[in-house]
């Protein structure tokens, strides 16, 4: 931002009213008036070039310094060419001297040269030659000097003529301020420029109304240079929640809009399934029946729990059930749907029911399922099971109602035994099997059926209470089809797979484990 100039003295603007002190009185510098465009132009001039030893002084009135530390002095003046005068006037000069003196009081007409300190010799860039002067084409020069730091209450400037032909048309004394500034939503106060060129005054900014320094951000600061320019901005402010940046201010979000945190973003329109927000909203309330999960951003539409799984089937396979379902028809507007499966078993005789989580086995953990199927095994035969599949999403915990579907299945058979060949010889096969422990108590006996492969007319049956049997009197090097079935009080359980086992050939006799 451009520096602001605060004028302490302006001779040209004063219209000849300042009454500066001349020394010696009337013989050197004197005030003159000229009319240009019907306006009086005043100047202090001196032109005693033909007389040697000139020492003419012009002193300003006392200037109150105020808050200035460094002052700038702008001079506008003309200087006539010494060659305009006979013989170049040996005593003629083309420069004058600028002085200043600081003081805490106005000395009035008590002028003492010794109190003044020279600032500089002022030389023109262009001199006015005789022909230009007579044609009224004077060459106006502009020179600027600065002085600082100043410490006293006020000061005088003085101009010493040592034999030049000078007209001083403008003397402007000012100091510089960095102007009041709004930048990055921070307000920086008008600040007096420092007096030392290398130094930069650090100035703290204050956030404009409804703006804040973002968490972890730097407080706004700028640097006021000696020339009144703001430099090196650091940090910034952001419009707080519920407000957005409009030009250099923070304006409340309009009704129907919101902003949930301090950021550079504009206010956003309230998302779906929210109520119209008031002015300056930081979020938009959800419509009735819709919710926002704690981790949901405020920009996300409000959502609701899902409906129940759409379609649920329970397919029994012995002592296993495969549950399958389809996703809810209404997801509630969310994608974070998970499923929970719970199990209840009922005894047909007593009608008593209870949870069965401890006695069954799931193909994967039954809570937080993301797939739409699960297999439940280790079910007891001749038991009624009810399975509940509940659909949940991120807002289900915010309501008391649940979205679920149930399926019931009766287990009438035990699970098929798992059969192994333990050993064989040329005339025997040793077979063992297993079923889940919960079902074992319901088994009365096991029935082993076997026959030669390819002979569909005859088969043999052996019954046993144990978990193994040796089948004797078999033909060597022959394949037998073997199946094991559990027998319960209520009837037959599920049969095992039909296994093919082969006896050894006579060359390799002996009871070998397989």
């Amino acid at each position: 931002a451009q520096g602001k100039e605060v004028v302490l003295l302006d001779f040209a603007a004063a219209g000849g009213e300042l009454g500066w002190l001349t020394h010696p009185y009337g013989k050197g510098w004197d005030l003159m008036q000229n009319i240009m465009n019907d306006m009086p132009i005043y100047m202090y001039s001196v032109c005693n070039v033909m007389s040697g030893d000139q020492d003419n002084w012009l002193r300003t009135n006392w200037v109150y310094r105020g808050e200035a530390e460094r002052i700038f002095i702008e001079l506008k003046f003309t200087v006539r060419d010494c060659n305009s005068f006979p013989g170049g006037a040996s005593s003629c000069k083309e420069t004058f001297n600028l002085y200043y003196a600081e003081s805490d009081l106005d000395y009035g007409t008590n002028f003492q040269k010794r109190l003044f300190t020279k600032i500089d010799t002022i030389a023109p860039d262009e001199i006015t030659v005789s022909s230009d002067f007579e044609a009224r084409h004077v060459k106006l020069n502009v020179e600027e000097r600065s002085v600082g730091p100043l410490t006293r209450k006020g000061f005088y400037l003085a101009f010493q003529d040592i034999g030049a032909c000078v007209a001083l048309l403008s003397v402007r004394v000012y100091y510089k301020k960095c102007p009041e500034l709004l930048q990055g939503l921070a307000h920086f106060p008008e600040t007096i420029a420092g007096s030392d060129a290398p130094s930069l005054a650090t100035v703290a900014g204050t956030c404009v109304d409804h703006a804040v320094v973002p968490p972890g951000g730097e407080e706004p600061r700028m640097h006021c240079a000696v020339d009144g320019e703001w430099l090196v901005p650091i940090g910034q402010c952001l419009c707080q929640a519920g407000y957005e940046k409009v030009e250099d201010a923070c304006q409340a979000c309009s009704p129907g809009f919101f902003k949930f945190e301090a950021s550079e973003s504009p206010c956003l329109e309230c998302p779906e399934h929210t109520l119209p927000s008031p002015e300056g909203a930081t979020s938009c309330e959800c419509e009735e029946g819709f919710f926002r999960a704690p981790q949901d951003p405020a920009s996300m539409p409000c959502t609701r729990p899902p409906s129940a799984p759409h379609y649920l089937t329970a397919v029994g396979m012995g002592a296993k059930v495969e549950l399958r379902w389809t996703p809810p028809q209404d997801s509630g507007g969310r994608e974070d749907i998970v499923y929970s499966v719970t199990c209840e078993q009922c005894w047909p005789e007593s009608g008593e029911c209870g949870p069965c989580e401890a006695s069954v086995r799931y193909s994967e953990p039954p809570h937080g399922l993301t797939r739409t199927s699960v297999t439940v095994s280790d079910l007891e035969p001749h038991m009624n099971y009810t399975f509940t599949v509940e659909a949940r999403n991120g807002v289900s915990g915010l309501v008391t109602s649940r979205s679920f579907r149930t399926a019931s299945v009766s287990i009438n058979q035990t699970e098929p035994p798992k059969v192994r060949l333990e050993g064989r010889s040329t005339t025997s096969l040793s077979v063992s099997w297993s079923i889940p422990p919960p079902q074992q108590s319901r088994v009365w006996k096991y029935e082993v059926t076997y026959r030669k492969k390819g002979d569909s007319n005859s088969y043999n049956v052996r019954r046993t209470e144990g978990f193994s049997v040796t089948l004797d009197d078999l033909a060597p090097d022959t394949t037998y089809l073997v199946q094991v079935q559990a027998l319960t009080q209520e009837g037959q359980g599920a049969g095992s797979k039909v296994h093919e086992f082969q006896t050894l050939s006579p060359e390799g006799s002996g009871n070998l484990a397989v």
């Epitope: 009454g19 001349t22 009185y25 009337g26 013989k27 032109c47 005693n48 007389s51």
Partner: antibody, heavy 120, light 108 residues
Framework: QVQLVQSGGGLVQPGGSLRLSCAAS????????MHWVRQAPGKGLEWVTV????????YYADSVKGRFTISRDNSKNTLYLQMNSLRAEDTAVYYC?????????????WGQGTLVTVSS | SELTQPPSVSVAPGQTVTITCQGD??????ASWYQQKPGTAPKLLIY???NRPSGVPDRFSGSSSGTSASLTITGAQAEDEADYYC????????????FGGGTKLTVL
């Protein structure tokens, strides 16, 4: 209106004294340098003396230096010329005049003039 | 330092007349011009480069060149018959301000 009204002229013997007055009105008297200019009978104008607006600075023509004293009373808006050791060659019409700017003029307002005759 | 004027000049009514003023001071400072009619105080006509106080007819104008200054009356009138004086600051330091000897203008 802006004007200067003079008084105090008359006949005086050589070596005598006379005090001329010039009453100002219609302008801020204390802001202007004031001059006395004289004109001997049938002759041209001759500058005599000047006083600064605050009265601190004065300057005289060589012909009157040491004999004449210019002074002013800004509270009374009046300019004075005290003439001592008068000579015959001081006989003239004396005009008070206002310097419109600065110390040296131009002289934009003049009094009506007062005749001083030095004769025995 | 002195300013020199011709003692007299004459002009026919309606004609243009120029009164000159010579002097070293005029190299450094502008001349002022005064008109004085018999029995009255002088009246300022021209000052500075060529400035006329209000009330002075625009037939009066001033100019300067080197050591010379001029007062020109364009279309002289009978009431312009008077004595005319030039005046300037003194650049020599001898005097503060100097007057020319005066020029009697006669309008024929």
């Amino acid at each position: 209106q802006v004007q200067l009204v003079q008084s105090g002229g008359g006949l005086v013997q050589p070596g005598g004294s006379l005090r001329l007055s010039c009453a100002a009105s219609g302008f801020t008297f204390s802001s202007y340098a004031m001059h006395w200019v004289r004109q001997a009978p049938g002759k041209g104008l001759e500058w005599v003396t000047v006083i600064s607006p605050d009265g601190h600075n004065t300057y005289y023509a060589d012909s009157v230096k040491g004999r004449f004293t210019i002074s002013r009373d800004n509270s009374k808006n009046t300019l004075y010329l005290q003439m001592n050791s008068l000579r015959a060659e001081d006989t003239a019409v004396y005009y008070c005049a206002r310097a419109s700017v600065g110390a040296t003029g131009p002289f934009d307002i003049w009094g009506q003039g007062t005749l001083v005759t030095v004769s025995s | 330092s002195e300013l020199t004027q011709p003692p007299s000049v004459s002009v026919a009514p309606g004609q243009t007349v120029t009164i000159t003023c010579q002097g070293d001071s005029l190299r450094s400072y502008y001349a002022s011009w005064y008109q004085q009619k018999p029995g009255t105080a002088p009246k300022l006509l021209i000052y500075g480069e060529n400035n006329r106080p209000s009330g002075v007819p625009d037939r009066f104008s001033g100019s300067s060149s080197g050591t010379s200054a001029s007062l020109t009356i364009t279309g002289a009138q009978a009431e312009d018959e008077a004595d005319y004086y030039c005046n300037s600051r003194d650049s020599s330091g001898t005097h503060l301000t100097v007057f020319g000897g005066g020029t009697k203008l006669t309008v024929l």
